[in-house]
Interface confidence: low
């Protein structure tokens, strides 16, 4: 399955952090989303395989890596009020 | 705070190889790319290559290509850089940088390690 | 390669001035641009990322702008801790490339 953490975070303006996301069944695509009322979900970063990334609907203020087909970390760069957020990652052959 | 420590100086004839050393801590190594960049005597700077602890896995600049290797382990969290078949142009300061925010992003930096060729 | 090119290579400047450095990029590098300073005879450090991002303890003093091809960063009041050489660096494709630098000298 895909394994996000963490579950919850506050985090403090300027602050950053990393958002964790694995998957163990050998997906290729991994991709970032965020929700929010009214906008459904929209696309921040997404990999098509190791080593390959690219942006989204919405990037700014994230980064992310893929190192390995496993792992797609996110992080956050310096946190804004605007990135408060429900946050999903997810994968795909 | 992130630390990064490199290894001394290091004095190597023409033909032979080197190998420098650099030491993080103040953050998870495993997640890092480190990344080792050189600066001749006078000159600017020059990207060789990256290692993701978490994996080994490694990007080199061309120039660099089947002359230097670069490492990692976790279990020390040390990256190593490798250069061989040295000659009297790889004269320089070479540092170790991590990326932390984004993997090309070269956030902090080593102290420097001085190679110097010479014979 | 992705040639960047800064401009100038050398700049006098006194304490209280607003300085402006340029880097150029070849092609195309998006926001994807770090300054670096470095003090002789010392490492790097870096002071903004993806062209206009502060980090941590940077002092606000420092700005940077642009995106595409052109970049600048600016200094709004030189403090005597400033003079040092300035780089720019791109992160948009491999290798990684840096400016030749330029070199912020005290009048």
């Known amino acids: 399955g895909v394994t996000q953490t963490p579950k919850f975070q506050v985090l403090k303006t300027g602050q950053s952090m990393t958002l964790q996301c694995a998957q163990d069944m050998n997906h290729e695509y991994m991709s970032w989303y965020r929700q929010d009322p009214g906008m459904g979900l929209r696309l921040i970063h997404y990999s098509v395989g190791a080593g390959i990334t690219d942006q989204g609907e919405v990037p700014n203020g994230y980064n992310v890596s893929r190192s390995t087909t496993e792992d797609f970390p996110l992080r956050l760069l310096s946190a804004a009020p605007s990135q408060t957020s429900v946050y999903f990652c997810a994968s795909s052959y | 705070q992130v630390q990064l420590v490199q290894s001394g100086a290091e004095v190597k004839k023409p033909g032979s190889s080197v190998k420098v050393s650099c030491k993080a801590s103040g953050h998870d190594f495993r997640l890092t790319y480190i990344h080792w960049v050189r600066q001749a005597p006078g000159q600017g700077l020059e990207w060789m290559g990256r290692?993701?602890?978490?994996?080994?896995?490694?990007k080199y600049n061309e120039k660099f290509k089947g002359r230097v290797t670069i490492t990692a382990d976790t279990s020390t969290s040390t990256a190593y850089m490798e250069l061989s078949s040295l000659r009297s142009e790889d004269t320089a300061v070479y540092y170790c940088?991590?990326?932390?925010?984004?993997?090309?992003?070269?956030?902090?930096w080593g102290q420097g390690t001085t190679v110097t060729v010479s014979s | 390669d992705i040639q960047m090119t800064q401009s100038p290579s050398f700049l006098s400047a006194s304490v209280g001035d607003r300085v402006t450095i340029t880097c150029k990029a070849s092609q195309n590098v998006e926001d994807r641009v770090v300054w670096h300073q470095q003090k002789p005879g010392k490492a790097p450090k870096a002071l903004i990322y993806s062209s206009s991002h502060r980090y941590k303890g940077v002092p606000s003093r420092f700005s940077g702008s642009g995106s595409g091809t052109e970049f600048t960063l600016t200094i709004s009041s030189l403090q005597p801790e400033d003079f040092a050489t300035y780089f720019c660096?791109?992160?948009?494709?491999?290798?990684?490339?840096f400016g030749q630098g330029t070199k912020l000298e005290i009048k």
């Open positions: 660096q791109q992160f948009k494709s491999y290798p990684l490339t």
């Open positions: 290692v993701y602890a978490g994996s080994g896995n490694t």
């Open positions: 940088a991590v990326s932390y925010y984004s993997y090309d992003v070269l956030d902090y």
